[in-house]
């Protein structure tokens, strides 16, 4: 069974069949006698109940509100109500691009590494019984493939495979022909073999501080997905209640590597925090790299060359 429509905000393209399925469907079958209602509100209109008489394009089934097809004026908020259960969706219907086989705003992007397994399968489980045929297009040119029910590409990726792949399902409903398009933007990238992780900035950092104040030591690295970055301080991490490792933030770079940042926060700096090493380490299968921070009292700054300071 097709899963329910749990996303509260949905964007669809005009002219395609579309459906909303509420998420208490199993419950609805248990209470067949319960009144179940669908409503729409948009702009000035407040909660107009929907039924097949309100539009020839709308069909209501047990758990589903169907549009044959969805049009621009279907934009708005939709509600399903049953006893104490309410589910709400915000539907945004966008204009179809008449000059292309797909609409740019409805594209799913995927990155595939060169020589890695690459697959596109054209499937649509909800409408599958109504689909007559399915075609797969690359950059809006039809690909000649064996299976015209579920066309599929399975291969090791090459740079030439980059492009926009559109699955177009053709289906009949009440004597009319409809189509549903799903487009993938496939980008082929260089082999993302592991890099040697690197900590950013100088290996030794003297940080000027004042007693009783707080300081944040930021450790950043460029690393692989499975590498780790962590702080080491004192005999046992966690023994000093004034020292906190903040949550690591990790963001993917366009090349498929990771930029990681981990902050060590020292609150209410005391004498015991001065002139000791706070080490940040990045560890990978290929070994470790460490950078060190030393807190120095501001008054003692004159004894250390200016270029070794960080703020």
């Amino acid at each position: 069974a097709e899963s329910c429509t749990s996303r509260p905000h949905i964007t669809v393209v005009e002219g395609e069949p579309f459906y909303l399925k509420h998420c208490s469907c199993s419950l609805a079958h248990e209470i067949e006698t319960t009144t179940k209602s669908w409503y729409k509100s948009s702009g000035s209109q407040e909660h107009v109940e929907l039924n097949p008489r309100s539009s020839s394009r709308i069909a209501l089934h047990d758990c589903v509100l169907e549009f044959w097809p969805v049009e621009l004026n279907d934009t708005g908020s939709y509600f399903f109500q049953m006893k104490n259960y309410t589910q709400k969706w915000k539907l945004n219907v966008i204009r179809r691009n008449k000059h292309s086989c797909f609409t740019e705003r409805q594209v799913t992007s995927k990155i595939v590494e060169v020589k890695k397994f690459f697959q596109i399968t054209c499937e649509n489980s909800y409408y599958q019984t109504l689909v007559n045929s399915t075609s797969l297009y690359k950059n809006c040119k039809k690909l000649l493939l064996e299976n015209n029910k579920n066309p599929t590409i399975k291969k090791n990726a090459e740079f030439e495979d980059q492009g926009y792949y559109s699955c177009v399902h053709f289906l009949h409903h009440n004597g009319k022909l409809f189509n549903i398009t799903k487009t993938f933007n496939i980008t082929i990238v260089e082999d993302r073999s592991n890099i040697v992780p690197v900590l950013l900035g100088p290996k030794l950092n003297h940080v000027a501080v004042e007693l009783g104040k707080n300081v944040r030591l930021n450790c950043s690295a460029l690393l692989n997905e499975e590498d780790v970055i962590y702080w080491m301080f004192g005999e046992e991490n966690g023994s000093d209640p004034n020292i906190h490792e903040e949550k690591e933030m990790r963001i993917m770079t366009p090349e498929g590597k990771w930029h990681a940042s981990k902050v060590l926060r020292i609150e209410n700096i005391g004498e015991s925090n001065l002139n000791v090493l706070y080490n940040c380490t990045v560890a990978s299968t290929g070994g470790t790299d460490t950078k060190s921070f030393i807190l120095v009292r501001k008054a003692d700054m004159a004894d250390i060359p200016g270029h070794v300071f960080t703020r």
């Epitope: 080491m232 966690g238 903040e246 690591e248």
Partner: antibody, heavy 128, light 107 residues
């Protein structure tokens, strides 16, 4: 898929020791820490401690200090929690959980790795 | 150790109700707080991290707010599958500490 599978139920006598295992699969074991949490019958959750799988560092709850030891075997992707000098109030379900304070942003939805995947639990009964 | 106090310890509610659970820390923990859901005989499940961030895959009817010492978990429209026990957890420092739990029961 990512999962943690724990060893089976144990019945122990007071004063004995128990060692619970937690085998990880579906992810790189030594890229994430492991926390141990227990729950006495009808009670709430109690954090026991945490081990960094990648360097062996540990943090233990004060009340268990000296009685608990957490270790890992990276060759088998398994974490262990040993509790010694067992008492009747150690009767509980013991859980392991993948635990790394890491927020990862790839695409639109961030994902947090703090106690995001749990084992099924191991019941330890201490009774004379 | 930081003490986490949850309230109420239990509450009764109906499907569709808006439910609010609060958690108070004995000291400032910034936004280092998570919320977990546990059903009988099952392991806990992470719902919210960093006080207000929804964990990937968790329904949007769950939301968290607060910082410092006072935090709130809200379920905007209670669903049948939401009847469970909810725990807050501070991950500001060690030892980590859980609240004592809030049991959400069917009215």
């Amino acid at each position: 898929q990512v999962q943690l599978v724990q060893s089976g139920a144990e019945v122990k006598k007071p004063g004995a020791s128990v060692k619970v295992s937690c085998k990880a699969s579906g992810y790189t074991f030594n890229s994430y820490g492991i926390s141990w949490v227990r729950q006495a019958p009808g009670q709430g959750l109690e954090w026991m401690g945490w081990i960094r799988t990648y360097n062996g560092n540990t943090n233990y709850a004060q009340k268990l200090q000296g009685r608990v030891t957490m270790t890992t075997d990276t060759s088998t992707s398994t974490a262990y929690m040993e509790l010694r000098s067992l008492r009747s109030d150690d009767t509980a379900v013991y859980y392991c959980a993948r635990d790394e304070a890491r927020i990862v942003v790839a695409g639109t939805t961030p994902y947090y790795y703090g106690m995001d995947v749990w084992g099924q639990g191991t019941t330890v009964t201490v009774s004379s | 150790a930081i003490q986490m106090t949850q309230s109420p310890s239990s509450l009764s509610a109906s499907v569709g109700d808006r439910v609010t659970i609060t958690c108070r820390a004995s000291q400032d923990i910034r936004n280092d707080l998570g919320w977990y859901q546990q059903k009988p005989g099952k392991a806990p499940k992470l719902l919210i991290y960093a006080a207000s961030s929804l964990q990937s895959g968790v329904p949007s009817r769950f939301s968290g707010s607060g910082s410092g010492t006072d935090f709130t978990l809200t379920i905007s429209s209670l669903q049948p599958e939401d009847f469970a026990t909810y725990y807050c957890l501070q991950d500001y420092n060690y030892p980590r500490t859980f609240g004592q739990g809030t049991k959400v029961e069917i009215k």
